[in-house]
C-alpha cells in the first residue's frame, strides 16, 4: 500500500465513540454451528454496531446468539443518545458505572479504574487490553468524574456535561469518554495465534491485538483459527486496517482499504466505515 492509496474519511470534530462492548461475546462472529436446522436468530454485528438476523443450525455456535432482536439489543447495545445529557434532579449515573469490572479477553494487562457500586468508589483493576465494558477508565480522576457523586451535589456525566443540582443547568466540561480499545475489524483479529494440531512448521502471520501489529508464528498445517495469514500484508489488510485510528485534534480517520463505502448511522452522527 502506498501513501497515495490512502483514503481520508473526514468526521466531525466530535470523536466517534469507541466500540465498547457490554459483554466480550458480543464481538464473536455469527456462528451457525455444524447442524442443519434453519432457525432465525439474532447476533450483534461489530461492524455495523447493530443487532442483525442470521440463520442458526440448531447446535453449538457461540454466545453471540439471541432468540429476539430485543434480547440482542439488551445484551449488546446501548442507547448513546439517551445518555449524553441527563436532566433529572436525581443525577443518575451512566448505566455502565454499575457494570462489574471486566478484564476482557486479551492478556496485555494494564492498570485501569472501575466504579465499584458496592463501595461507591473508583478502584483499580487489571484490564487485558481489548473488549471488556465501559466501566473502565484510564485514570482515577476520569472514573471519579463520570461515576462517583461530585462533592457539590452534581454528577459529571460520561460525555463531560456537568449537572448543577440546584438549578438543573448544564455546564459544559472538556469532553472525555472512557478510552478503550477501538475495535472495528473482524473478531478473529482478537484471537491468539493458534498453531493447530498437525506437525508441519509453516511460516504464517497473526494479528497481535495487544501491540497492534502483525507477527510471525509457526502453523502446524491444520486446525487453528482464522487469525492466520500467509503474508504480513494480508494480515495487515484484514486486521490492522480494521482498527480506526482516532485522531482527536484533526478529526481525520485514515484507512487504507479501497473498498465501496457503506453508510452507517451511529447514535448522534454519521460516519463512513469501510466494508471489510
Amino acid at each position: 500500500d502506498s501513501e497515495e492509496d490512502e483514503e481520508h474519511t473526514i468526521i466531525t470534530d466530535t470523536e466517534l465513540p469507541p466500540l465498547k462492548l457490554m459483554h466480550s461475546f458480543c464481538a464473536f462472529k455469527a456462528d451457525d454451528g455444524p447442524c442443519k436446522a434453519i432457525m432465525k436468530r439474532f447476533f450483534f454485528n461489530i461492524f455495523t454496531r447493530q443487532c442483525e438476523e442470521f440463520i442458526y443450525g440448531g447446535c453449538e455456535g457461540n454466545q453471540n446468539r439471541f432468540e429476539s432482536l430485543e434480547e440482542c439489543k439488551k445484551m449488546c447495545t446501548r442507547d448513546n443518545a439517551n445518555r449524553i445529557i441527563k436532566t433529572t434532579l436525581q443525577q443518575e449515573k451512566p448505566d455502565f458505572c454499575f457494570l462489574e469490572e471486566d478484564p476482557g479477553i486479551c492478556r496485555g494487562y494494564i492498570t485501569r479504574y472501575f466504579y465499584n457500586n458496592q463501595t461507591k468508589q473508583c478502584e483499580r483493576f487489571k484490564y487485558g487490553g481489548c473488549l471488556g465494558n465501559m466501566n473502565n477508565f484510564e485514570t482515577l480522576e476520569e472514573c471519579k468524574n463520570i461515576c462517583e457523586d461530585g462533592p457539590n451535589g452534581f454528577q459529571v456525566d460520561n460525555y463531560g456535561t456537568q449537572l448543577n443540582a440546584v438549578n438543573n443547568s448544564l455546564t459544559p466540561q472538556s469532553t472525555k469518554v472512557p478510552s478503550l480499545f477501538e475495535f472495528h475489524g473482524p473478531s478473529w483479529c482478537l484471537t491468539p495465534a493458534d498453531r493447530g494440531l498437525c506437525r508441519a512448521n509453516e511460516n504464517r502471520f497473526y494479528y497481535n491485538s495487544v501491540i497492534g501489529k502483525c507477527r510471525p508464528f509457526k502453523y502446524s498445517g491444520c486446525g487453528g483459527n482464522e487469525n492466520n495469514f500467509t503474508s504480513k500484508q494480508e494480515c495487515l489488510r484484514a486486521c490492522k486496517k480494521g482498527f480506526i485510528q482516532r485522531i482527536s485534534k484533526g478529526g481525520l480517520i485514515k484507512t487504507k482499504r479501497k473498498r465501496k463505502k457503506q453508510r452507517v448511522k451511529i447514535a448522534y452522527e454519521e460516519i463512513f466505515v469501510k466494508n471489510m
Partner: antibody
C-alpha cells in the same frame, strides 16, 4: 474483624481433583476481588489467580491456566478453587486473600495444605 | 514476568538493633497511574502472611512505626529501626504493578 478461613485441603493422587473453599467474614464480601496464592513447602509465595467482585471474570497464573478454576458465591460469602489434573508441583499451602481498592492483597487466610502424591 | 530479588536471604539481628532488607525488581514498578505498587509482607513462624506495607511506604493499620519502607523504580528497602522479638519471621516483598503478581524469595529475620 476481617477473617478468611480456607478448607478442603488434603492428600490427592497426581491427576486427581480437589476443591478448596474460603469462608469470608467481617467485611462486605461482594465488594472485593479475591485471590488465591500458594506456598510450596519451604519455598516462596506464588500468585495463583484472582476473581472479580461479581465473579464473572477471572485471571490465572500460566502454571494453572486451564487446570484450576476460581469461583465465588457472594450470597454465601465464599470463594472456591477447583483444582483438576493435579501435579506434584501443585503441592503447597493455599491461601485466599482479599484484594483492596488498589487491587493489592491486604488480608490473608491461615491456609490449607494440598499434597499431591505421584 | 517481573523477577523480585531480595537480599539478604537470612538476617541474624540483635534485639534493639536496626535491620534492613533490600528488594530489587527486574523492571520498574512505577505504574502508568504514577503509583508504585511495591508491598511488604511479614510471615511469622507457623502463621499466614500479613501485609505490613503497601505502595512502597504506607503502613497498614496496627503495624508499629518502627517499620519503614522506601525506594522507587526498581530498588526498595524495608527497615526495622529497633528489632523486637515479635519481628522474627520471613519478610517478602511483592509487586502488584505488573501481571502476574510476583514475590521475592523471602528474607528470614532471626535473633542472634
Amino acid at each position: 474483624e476481617v477473617q478468611l478461613v480456607e478448607s478442603g485441603g488434603g492428600l490427592v493422587k497426581s491427576g486427581g481433583s480437589l476443591r478448596l473453599s474460603c469462608a469470608a467474614s467481617g467485611f462486605t464480601f461482594s465488594s472485593y476481588a479475591m485471590s488465591w496464592v500458594r506456598q510450596a513447602p519451604g519455598k516462596g509465595l506464588e500468585w495463583v489467580g484472582t476473581i472479580t467482585t461479581g465473579g464473572s471474570y477471572t485471571y490465572y497464573a500460566d502454571s494453572v491456566q486451564g487446570r484450576f478454576t476460581i469461583s465465588r458465591d457472594n450470597a454465601k460469602n465464599s470463594l472456591y478453587l477447583q483444582m483438576n489434573s493435579l501435579r506434584a508441583e501443585d503441592t503447597a499451602v493455599y491461601y485466599c486473600a482479599r484484594q483492596d481498592g488498589n487491587f493489592l492483597m491486604d488480608y490473608w487466610g491461615q491456609g490449607t495444605l494440598v499434597t499431591v502424591s505421584s | 514476568d517481573v523477577v523480585m530479588t531480595q537480599t539478604p536471604l537470612s538476617l541474624p539481628v540483635t534485639l534493639g538493633q536496626p535491620a534492613s532488607i533490600s528488594c530489587k525488581s527486574s523492571q520498574s514498578l512505577l505504574d502508568t497511574d504514577g503509583k508504585t505498587y511495591l508491598n511488604w509482607l511479614q510471615q511469622r513462624p507457623g502463621q499466614s502472611p500479613k501485609r505490613l506495607i503497601y505502595l512502597v511506604s504506607k503502613l497498614d493499620s496496627g503495624v508499629p512505626d518502627r517499620f519503614t519502607g522506601s525506594g522507587s523504580g526498581t530498588d526498595f528497602t524495608l527497615k526495622i529501626s529497633r528489632v523486637e522479638a515479635e519481628d522474627v519471621g520471613v519478610y517478602y516483598c511483592w509487586q502488584g504493578t505488573h501481571f502476574p503478581f510476583t514475590f521475592g524469595q523471602g528474607t528470614k529475620v532471626e535473633i542472634k
